[in-house]
Amino acid sequence: MAVTACQGLGFVVSLIGIAGIIAATCMDQWSTQDLYNNPVTAVFNYQGLWRSCVRESSGFTECRGYFTLLGLPAMLQAVRALMIVGIVLGAIGLLVSIFALKCIRIGSMEDSAKANMTLTSGIMFIVSGLCAIAGVSVFANMLVTNFWMSTANMYTGMGGMVQTVQTRYTFGAALFVGWVAGGLTLIGGVMMCIACRGLAPEETNYKAVSYHASGHSVAYKPGGFKASTGFGSNTKNKKIYDGGARTEDEVQSYPSKHDYV
């Protein structure tokens, strides 16, 4: 029962995590205009992996896609790749894990096959979560670097006759969604791997051997070796401890309509 719960919870947590990774990848708020100590622009700027947007004071928002592939920074391309790999692996992991769920019966699939599938999906979720966390972290690092570079430019003068507005960007909501989602997918993957150990079939039992004693016949059937790890087959008289670790998804609140200038 506990194995089923661990596996089910791992699946649900991973599902939420992957949905979050997809949401983060699609979101436009990867970087948002830093309003502190900046020239007060009458528009608010924010950027995603696929397009950049400008919101005017009226609330009118206009977005423009990055219609070039070669002209984009290599880091941005790397982040896109990491997020897409994370989504693809996560999606495959979800597909595999559906069939691996103990509560779902598909033909005469053996426990060993379910265990292997659970482990496979668990590893996929772990890699997917790591990809998302890596992608978001690379982007965050890029932002921090650019932030301090533009701050230096602001205070050391622009050079030339015509000044341009130096817009600095800070962390957007998508980064926090990505970090949390990546973490959830990772946790879900670990839970699947743990569940896999519980699903794994017992170590080879000794065949029943009959000992024919003189006088009367007694059949001795040993129960077979069981490891004392607590992850053996869950026999009727054995309880497996379920830690029941709960993760709380703290949602980063982001106003839907800023009342920026």
């Epitope: 007060v40 700027n45 005017e56 341009t164």
Partner: antibody, heavy 119, light 113 residues
Framework: EVQLVESGGGLVQPGGSLRLSCAVS????????MHWVRQAPGKGLEWVAY????????YYADSVKGRFTVSRDNAKNSLYLQMNSLRAEDTAVYYC????????????WGQGTLVTVSS | DIVMTQSPDSLAVSLGERVTMNCKSS????????????LTWYQQKPGQPPKLLIY???TRESGVPDRFSGSGSGTDFTLTISSVQAEDVAVYYC?????????FGQGTKLEIK
């Protein structure tokens, strides 16, 4: 039809105070930012102040900062400009202007109210 | 603050003539996020409040005759009247609507010869 009607202008002594009002009709006032723009007799336009739809953001021209206060009452569809420590150079026609939906433009202007600062 | 400089200060043209007036800003008004220039043009006829003509440097406000057109990007902008009519006699102002404080040019006065 969008209408903006300014009132409260008049003759005031230097150092005195005046409160301008702008009554708005014909659009959802609470959804739009509003500006005050002034024009000294025979001179060009000078932007004075801006207040966002939800009063979160308020900006002033350097020449009036600390002396003028812009406010709004969305329930009454009214915009206000409280002018303190008035100077002779504040003499102008004051326009109440709506901030447009596109391009940050100032799309609808009132007829203006004349403020004269003189001793 | 952004300084807006208009040229010429005034010009007199014949009816039907093509006229251009310029506006230069001390800082770029181009917003890369949406590829827009935050510059607006207004027309003020004698004894009237200003009227919006052009926003985003080149987009005509609805109801504005198509003889009015705006162009330019970054710091240099132009308002063109393809064929001047008697009712176009007015002062034309450009405005920075990108960075606060918002600033107007000093205006270009258009007269008919």
């Amino acid at each position: 039809e969008v209408q903006l009607v300014e009132s409260g202008g008049g003759l005031v002594q230097p150092g005195g105070s005046l409160r301008l009002s702008c009554a708005v009709s014909g659009f959802t006032f609470s959804s739009f930012g509003m500006h005050w723009v002034r024009q000294a007799p025979g001179k060009g336009l000078e932007w004075v102040a801006y207040i966002s739809s939800g009063t979160t953001n308020i900006y002033y021209a350097d020449s009036v900062k600390g002396r003028f206060t812009v406010s709004r009452d969305n329930a009454k569809n009214s915009l206000y400009l409280q002018m303190n420590s008035l100077r002779a150079e504040d003499t102008a026609v004051y326009y109440c202007v709506r901030s447009g939906y596109y391009g940050q433009s100032l799309d609808y202007w009132g007829q203006g109210t004349l403020v004269t600062v003189s001793s | 603050d952004i300084v807006m400089t208009q040229s010429p200060d005034s010009l007199a043209v014949s009816l039907g003539e093509r006229v251009t007036m310029n506006c230069k800003s001390s800082q770029s008004l181009f917003q890369s996020g949406n590829q827009r220039n935050y510059l607006t043009w207004y027309q003020q006829k004698p004894g009237q409040p200003p009227k919006l003509l052009i926003y985003w440097a080149s987009t005509r406000e609805s109801g504005v005759p198509d003889r009015f057109s705006g162009s330019g990007s970054g710091t240099d902008f132009t308002l063109t009247i393809s064929s001047v009519q008697a009712e176009d006699v007015a002062v034309y102002y450009c405005q920075n609507v990108y960075i606060y404080p918002l600033t107007f040019g000093q205006g270009t006065k258009l007269e008919i010869k």
